[in-house]
Interface confidence: medium
């Protein structure tokens, strides 16, 4: 359905508040360094223009595409060249190249300060202007997460304001706010990572990769839905994600609302779990659908082997419509196995496809593919064994100790990767233990494998910006579904030339004594990475000795009366003993 004015159409569909929020998110994701007030000004200008177009669709400029309107606003920013450098060159291009250019300049790791929640200050700001407070949240999250799923960010901003509505009345604001903000922060970070993986899937592997992922996920959630229902939703959902990943946030939010309506209109055919979602307002409804629990697997489903191994017509069915046949295999496998990770289901489908490619070219295809399900078994056993082994390690050493084991493991695999990235990734990997190892057996695999996919995607995104390791590039680019097994298979990189010893990472001052525990851990873990970069073949015993010396040194100096004096005098001794221990 074509509209004379796209901007008027979206303004009418979304309403003024959501329109403004989405425009603010879009600008903040493109211009990540601009101050909030600058963005507010741009949003106001575009909102006024949209209202003009609502009143008169044939007003000058109202027929322009949203990319043209957005891009023109971005290119008006006076400090574009000095703040963003060659991003300003995008403004010399025409659409659609101009928007592509802006997208390519999104920074996944912008140098922005860590946000520290100060309850009294935040409550004062909230009470002074709730709308501005809501906008500031959108802005701060969007600029730090330039691929955040925009309509979902609107949902979180509303939730965030709700928390302040409740807690700023409380006697102890901090006690009420901080745990809620922390819990929300975790959810927001996970949401950001999920969307980043979706966008990377589309950008690096094409929309077929995202469609396959969505087929598996939705088949697990809606196992009683038929294949055509699942593929219809997957097609619409892929369009929504393509739009959001491409910066078309107004279309994305609008289409997401339509999809939520479709799902609720057809909930009887999809899942008994949707009832609780479908009475909610649109943003909450969409969020609820995305998070909905898996419905029970229907009883009496025939065994998979009937259609996909025993049937003599498998090759005929496959060759007539490869994507549909493989899609139905993925659907049928996924709906029967809610206890499998999506990434594992995708590996099963990939290997099944490879088997058919091989077998269907043979004299007796049936004899060849009849045993395919035996061949697939190792794809389920491998992650199960890995999870068992790593959860045992986690249970033995706790989160911090497990993180340190992962730091050793991953620094040896990819010592060329920057130290902050290795620390960040290993810390995240270590948190998988806390998040997943306590879960029941039926949830352990989806929890670990799918969470690992998010973390390894973060590594791939950061590494792509400054590629330093051929092994990492290979694991990141060869196969989306096999990324985790690829990283698991990496061993010590023998091509790596060790770094000279860098004293800087063993230069400590009295400020370490007052750091929060997390930051203290990061300092120690940074030192551990640097040790390994200097001596990748250091034994676990040597590393243990050095780290124990280091902890003793910090403890001793932090207990001293003259803390800094202690660091000044004992620091060089630590450096010397470290070098001696590694000699």
């Amino acid at each position: 359905d074509t509209h004379k004015s796209e901007i008027a159409h979206r303004f009418n569909d979304l309403g003024e508040e959501n329109f403004q929020g989405l425009v603010l998110i879009a600008f903040s994701q493109y211009l990540q360094q601009c101050p909030f007030d600058e963005h507010v000004k741009l949003v106001k200008e575009l909102t006024e223009f949209a209202k003009t177009c609502v009143a008169d669709e044939s007003h000058a400029g109202c027929d322009k595409s949203l990319h043209t309107l957005f891009g023109d606003e971005l290119c008006k920013v006076a400090t574009l060249r000095e703040t963003y450098g060659d991003m300003a060159d995008c403004c010399e291009k025409q659409e659609p190249e101009r928007n592509e250019c802006f997208l390519n300049h999104k920074d996944d790791s912008p140098d922005l300060p860590k946000l520290k929640p100060e309850p009294d200050t935040l409550c004062a700001e909230f009470k002074a202007d709730e709308k501005k407070f809501w906008g500031k949240y959108l802005y701060e999250v969007a600029r730090r997460h330039p691929y955040f799923y925009a309509p979902e960010l609107l949902y979180y901003a509303n939730k965030y304001n709700g928390v302040f509505q409740e807690c700023c009345q409380a006697e102890d604001k901090g006690a009420c706010l901080l745990p809620k903000i922390d819990a929300m922060r975790e959810k927001v970070l996970a949401s950001s990572a999920r969307q980043r993986l979706r966008c990377a899937s589309i950008q690096k592997f094409g929309e077929r990769a995202l469609k396959a992922w969505s087929v598996a996920r939705l088949s697990q959630k809606f196992p009683k839905a038929d294949f055509t229902d699942v593929t219809k939703i997957v097609t619409d959902l892929t369009k929504v994600h393509k739009e959001c990943c491409h910066g078309d946030l107004l279309e994305c939010a609008d289409d997401r609302a339509d999809l939520a309506k479709y799902i609720c209109d057809h909930q009887d055919a999809l899942s008994s779990k949707l009832k609780e979602c479908c009475d909610k307002p649109v943003l909450e409804k969409s969020h609820c659908i995305a998070e909905v629990d898996k419905d029970a697997v229907p009883e009496n489903l025939p065994p998979l082997t009937a259609d996909f191994a025993e049937d003599k017509e498998v090759c005929k069915n496959y060759q007539e419509a490869k994507d549909v046949f493989l899609g139905s295999f993925l659907y049928e496998y996924s709906r029967r196995h809610p206890e499998y990770a999506v990434s594992v289901l995708l590996r099963l489908a990939k290997e099944y496809e490879a088997t058919l490619e091989d077998c269907c070219a043979k004299e007796d295809p049936h004899a060849c593919y009849a045993t395919v399900f035996d061949k697939l078994k190792h794809l389920v056993d491998e992650p199960q064994n890995l999870i068992k082994k790593n959860c045992e390690l986690f249970e033995k050493h706790g989160e911090y100790g497990f993180q340190n084991a992962l730091i050793v493991r991953y620094t040896r695999k990819a010592p060329q990767v920057s130290t902050p990235t290795l620390v960040e990734i290993s810390r995240s990997l270590g948190k998988v233990g806390t998040k997943c190892c306590a879960k029941p057996e039926s949830e352990r695999m989806p929890c670990t494998e799918d969470y690992l996919s998010l973390i390894l995607n973060r590594l791939c995104v950061l590494h792509e910006k400054t590629p330093v390791s051929e092994k990492v590039t290979k694991c990141c680019t060869e196969s989306l579904v096999n990324r985790r097994p690829c990283f698991s298979d990496l061993t010590l990189d023998e091509t790596y030339v060790p770094k000279p010893f860098d004293e800087k990472f063993f230069t400590f001052h009295a400020d370490i004594c007052t750091l929060p525990d997390t930051e203290k851990q990061i300092k120690k873990q940074t030192a551990l990475v640097e040790l390994l970069k200097h001596k990748p073949k250091a034994t676990d015993e040597q590393l243990k000795t050095v780290m124990e010396n280091f902890v003793a040194f910090v403890d001793k100096c932090c207990a001293a009366d003259d803390k800094e004096g202690c660091f000044v005098l004992e620091g060089p001794k630590l450096v010397a003993s470290t070098q001696a221990a590694l000699a």
Epitope: F501, E503, K504, T507, A510, D511, V568, P572, V575, Q579
Partner: nanobody, 119 residues
Framework: EVQLLESGGGLVQPGGSLRLSCAAS????????MLWVRQAPGKGLEWVSV????????YYADSVKGRFTISRDNSKNTLYLQMNSLRAEDTAVYYC????????????WGQGTLVTVSS
């Protein structure tokens, strides 16, 4: 090769002020923490102040806290020590040093600048 060149010392009356400078070369100054140490006549080395590579945080020995201020200009590869309310016991040769060293002594430091506080 690492070079550290201190300047700004001299004779000053008690209660007076001096500003010491240390020009650095031969290493990446902006990634190195730096410190001032001093040696009074017939005494051992005493650390005075440390500054982080970014300029903050800074640290001071109790004996100079509130009177001395350490600072740096990374664009000029220069370290400073502003000394106010000087006392006779501040008399010493002042050295700037790269912190820490790989051995149990400060192996990168300059030739020093003498500060004499006397009436």
């Amino acid at each position: 090769e690492v070079q550290l060149l201190e300047s700004g010392g001299g004779l000053v009356q008690p209660g007076g002020s001096l500003r010491l400078s240390c020009a650095a070369s031969g290493f990446t100054f902006d990634t190195s923490s730096m410190l001032w140490v001093r040696q009074a006549p017939g005494k051992g080395l005493e650390w005075v102040s440390v500054i982080h590579q970014s300029g903050t945080p800074t640290y001071y020995a109790d004996s100079v806290k509130g009177r001395f201020t350490i600072s740096r200009d990374n664009s000029k590869n220069t370290l400073y020590l502003q000394m106010n309310s000087l006392r006779a016991e501040d008399t010493a040769v002042y050295y700037c040093a790269k912190f820490p060293s790989s051995r149990m002594k400060f192996d990168y430091w300059g030739q020093g600048t003498l500060v004499t506080v006397s009436s």
